[in-house]
Interface confidence: medium
Amino acid sequence: VLEVYYTSLRCRCVQESSVFIPRRFIDRIQILPRGNGCPRKEIIVWKKNKSIVCVDPQAEWIQRMMEVLRKRSSSTLPVPVFKRKIP
């Protein structure tokens, strides 16, 4: 399990993965802007199996996926049923 918590730079991601995660395994993607003590944008992925992965924002697959999701987006539909707890 990839750990996601405070570091000395106040980034949440201790390490980031570039490994492709199929969209069908993803529940939620949280975008954290850079700044406030962390020099980079962070992308945290909650998988349907409840595990949490930090994804390298430069990974081509996540950039492509974000573009596809952005183009087909609908705001505030439907209410999430999961609890986004870091284990």
């Epitope: 918590y5 993803i26 975008i31 802007p33």
Partner: antibody
């Protein structure tokens, strides 16, 4: 229906403290980051602070760092802003706001925009 | 901090007209921009996210466009209920920042 109701505003002397609350309903509070945004009289909007959905991380604008503390009680679905060492430039209407997300191809994407706002509570810092 | 320069500061237009509000950012924000409408004495209402995606329930006469450092909000066929102040907001980096607002009135 998402509802955010702020309370705790009022007139306070410079250097004193005040604690704002925001009661949330109509959504799973513990699933969302929350923020405070303020608006000085006849002025624009100014982001103040954000707290992560589980309370584990907080983000502040430089001018309030060390003076303001954002926190949340997920069991009570309530957001707080503890304001210490208040200054006249902190005079504003303080809005509680919920982070946004969009739903696309069975995936939720969470972002720092604000689709839901409370009605605001006015804080006046004056002697 | 990313600076948001909004123009014009105020705007007067006739009913049925098309109006444009501009928002320039001090650096590329990768279309991570939202627009809000605030009517006098009310809290802000969310209109657009990701520069051009319309929030559910917002009339289709509102549209957003732009990329890089230049963004705009367009209101087609201006209605009396559109009288408000409009703000842009970037969420590309902390601190999150807003434009100074554009006050729209009917001629």
């Amino acid at each position: 229906e998402v509802q955010l109701v702020e309370s705790g505003g009022g007139l306070v002397l410079p250097g004193r403290s005040l604690k704002l609350s925001c009661a949330a309903s109509g959504f799973t509070f513990s699933d969302y980051a929350m923020a405070w945004v303020r608006q000085a009289p006849k002025k624009g909007l100014e982001w103040v602070a954000t707290v992560f959905y589980d309370g584990s991380d907080t983000f502040y604008r430089d001018s309030v760092k060390g003076r303001f503390t954002i926190s949340r009680d997920n069991a009570k679905s309530t957001l707080y802003l503890q304001m210490d060492s208040l200054r006249s430039e902190d005079t504003a209407t303080y809005y509680c706001a919920r982070e946004g997300d969009y739903y696309s191809r069975h995936v939720y994407v969470g972002y720092n925009w604000f689709p839901h706002w409370g009605q605001g509570t006015l804080v006046t810092v004056s002697s | 901090d990313i600076r948001m320069t909004q123009s014009p500061a105020s705007l007067s237009a006739s009913l049925g007209e098309t109006v444009n509000i501009e928002c320039l950012t001090s650096e590329d924000i990768n279309s991570e921009l939202a627009w809000y409408q605030q009517k006098p004495g009310k809290f802000p209402q969310f209109l657009i996210y990701n520069a051009n995606s319309l929030q559910d329930g917002v009339p289709s006469r509102f549209s957003g466009s732009g990329s890089g450092t230049q963004y705009s909000l367009k209101i087609n066929s201006l209605q009396s209920e559109d009288v408000a102040t409009y703000f842009c907001q970037q969420y590309n980096s902390y601190p999150l920042t807003f434009g100074s607002g554009t006050e729209l009135e009917i001629k």
